[in-house]
């Protein structure tokens, strides 16, 4: 009966026409929502003026459905037995789901301001930058609404600036109208063992930000993983979001919807320092802002997003060091609201359900040369907002995979 | 490569005026930002006037503002900078610089010396 079974599960979740696995792959049953929390800027100008602690409130949820659209230029290649794809980006807003509008206005910190005097550091460029910054009426802070704020504005301060600069700002943007990838995934046709698991992301199967292991492209993108998924496993997978391959580790067994799936979770290992996990060295890029790779829990992704100073974070800074924090007040971390986990189903693999947990931040430094930036004492690592992505599969869904899988091995 | 050459430089009496020009070459001027910076003796290179690529924005030091004027022209690949009411305060090496975002630094010019005294 077992080599029956395993027989038949090797034979569904296979990535080609015809299997469970592809119909599902291709275009997710599953419906996937990211939603945001801002953190709304309550003491913009004592922060500029004095170098005040930032002191934060988050608003939100404001809820958008993605994931909704089919993987595009789905091409099998049966020479190294690989399938390849773009997963075209979407986001419609939920007002139902959200606690506002789109057109609901936050006081956050300057995008452009903080990345241009980050970019550019020689104090000729930044006598020019502070010219234009104060000719656009810029500031440290700026008021925005959420749709500029995630998905873009014409920034007065970039309009200035001369040729070759993009004047829109937002922190997805572009984002409609874009895809990720190509990624190039194993299709287990000839070894299921394999099956998901990425070969290589745009062409490589490296990704040219980090140096040595941190540099790899490891595992499948966490939408499923090769079956027979043991608790003993350390689950590898890549994720563009985070410009970086990541893992996740047996936690607990979890009953959803009367299937037996394994949580697995991010680990707080993860994100540690090389002072504590010493394979985490080639995650530290430069030595201020890491105080010599003592700090933990953000990591800089400036080189994957064109030198811009963003800091991926787990939200409210979990399992990020005090000194990351301290400058910012209205933090309220917790594991059960802020980790990563997947709820992984072990006989195919399939993530049933998950929730993908980061927060964005980005670095604003004093700067003797900027008017907006001169009374600052100390770098800050400035939380912008928080997002949470969840997906879980639908009872219909559910009660299929109990009959099919689940049901015919108990 | 590269050049810009400053001209227009001399000893003036205070009230009176200069006009200071820079010819640039090796590069698509229209695409710059075209500034004009002075380092005094014993202090700190500081920017005097900017003018943006299109050339619809200029800015001023606070203390050159009314007084002094940047203008370009692209078809000449030129940039100036009137200079009235001449200040002995104003005495410094004036020096021309073109700069986009592609540049982690400006390009600079050598410069040209003005003297404010009677």
């Known amino acids: 009966g077992d080599l029956l079974i395993q027989k038949t599960i090797k034979k569904q979740v296979v990535l080609e026409e015809g299997t469970i696995a592809f119909k599902n792959w291709v275009k997710t049953g599953t419906e996937v929502y990211r939603q945001f929390w801002i953190f709304d800027v309550q003491n913009p100008q004592e922060v500029m003026m004095n170098s005040s602690n930032i002191q934060v409130k988050q608003r939100g949820p404001y809820t958008y459905r993605v994931r909704f659209l089919a993987k595009e230029n789905v091409t099998q290649d049966a020479e190294d037995n690989t399938v390849s794809f773009l997963q075209p980006n979407g986001a419609i807003f939920e007002p139902s789901l959200s606690v506002g509008t789109e057109a609901d206005n936050f006081t956050v910190l300057n995008l452009a301001v903080a990345a241009a005097s980050h970019i550019y550091q020689n104090q000729f460029v930044q006598m020019i930058l502070n010219s234009l910054i104060n000719k656009s009426k810029s500031s440290m802070f700026q008021v925005r609404t959420l749709r500029e704020l995630l998905w873009g504005y014409r920034d007065p301060f970039l309009s200035l600036v001369p040729y070759p600069v993009t004047t829109t700002v937002g922190l997805f943007y572009p984002y409609n109208n874009t895809a990720d990838g190509v990624y190039k995934v194993f299709n287990g046709k000839d070894n299921i063992s394999k099956v998901a698991i990425i070969d290589t992301y745009k062409g490589k199967r490296n990704l040219s930000y980090w140096e040595s292991h941190c540099d790899m492209i490891n595992g499948t993108d966490a939408a499923s993983f090769p079956p027979f998924v043991e608790k003993s496993q350390v689950l590898q997978f890549f994720s563009s979001d985070i410009c970086r391959s990541i893992y996740a580790v047996f936690e607990s067994d979890v009953n959803l919807k009367g299937i037996p799936v394994y949580r697995f979770v991010l680990p707080s290992k993860a994100f540690a320092s090389p002072v504590e996990n010493p394979d985490n060295y080639c995650f530290c890029t430069e030595k201020i802002i890491s105080k010599n790779c003592t700090s933990y829990g953000v990591l800089d992704i400036s080189k994957c997003k064109e030198g811009r100073p963003v800091y991926i974070s787990l939200p409210h800074f979990l399992y990020a060091s005090p000194d990351v924090s301290e400058p910012i007040d209205g933090l309220n971390p917790n594991e059960e609201e802020h980790r990563t986990y997947l709820d992984i189903e072990p006989i195919t693999g399939f993530t049933l359900q998950f929730a993908k947990r980061l927060q964005v931040n980005l670095l604003v430094k004093p700067s003797e040369k900027i008017q907006v930036l001169k009374n600052l004492k100390r770098n800050y690592i400035v939380p912008i907002l928080w997002l949470n992505e969840t997906g879980t599969i639908g009872d219909e869904k559910a009660n299929m995979f109990r009959s099919q899988v689940t049901g015919k091995i108990n | 490569q590269v050049q810009l050459q400053e001209s227009g430089g001399g000893l003036v009496q205070p009230g009176g005026s200069l006009r200071l020009s820079c010819a640039a070459s090796g590069f698509t001027f229209s695409s710059y930002a075209m500034s004009w910076y002075r380092q005094a003796p014993g202090k700190e290179r500081e920017l005097v006037a900017l003018?943006?690529?299109?050339?619809?924005?200029?800015d001023y030091a606070d203390s050159v503002k009314g007084r002094f004027t940047i203008s370009r022209d692209d078809a000449e690949k030129t940039v100036s900078l009137q200079m009235n009411s001449l200040k002995p305060e104003d005495t410094a090496v004036y020096y021309c610089?073109?700069?986009?975002?592609?540049?982690?630094?400006?390009?600079w010019g050598q410069g040209t010396q003005v003297t404010v005294s009677s």
């Open positions: 610089s073109a700069w986009r975002a592609s540049l982690y630094e400006p390009y």
């Open positions: 003018i943006t690529s299109a050339g619809g924005t200029t």
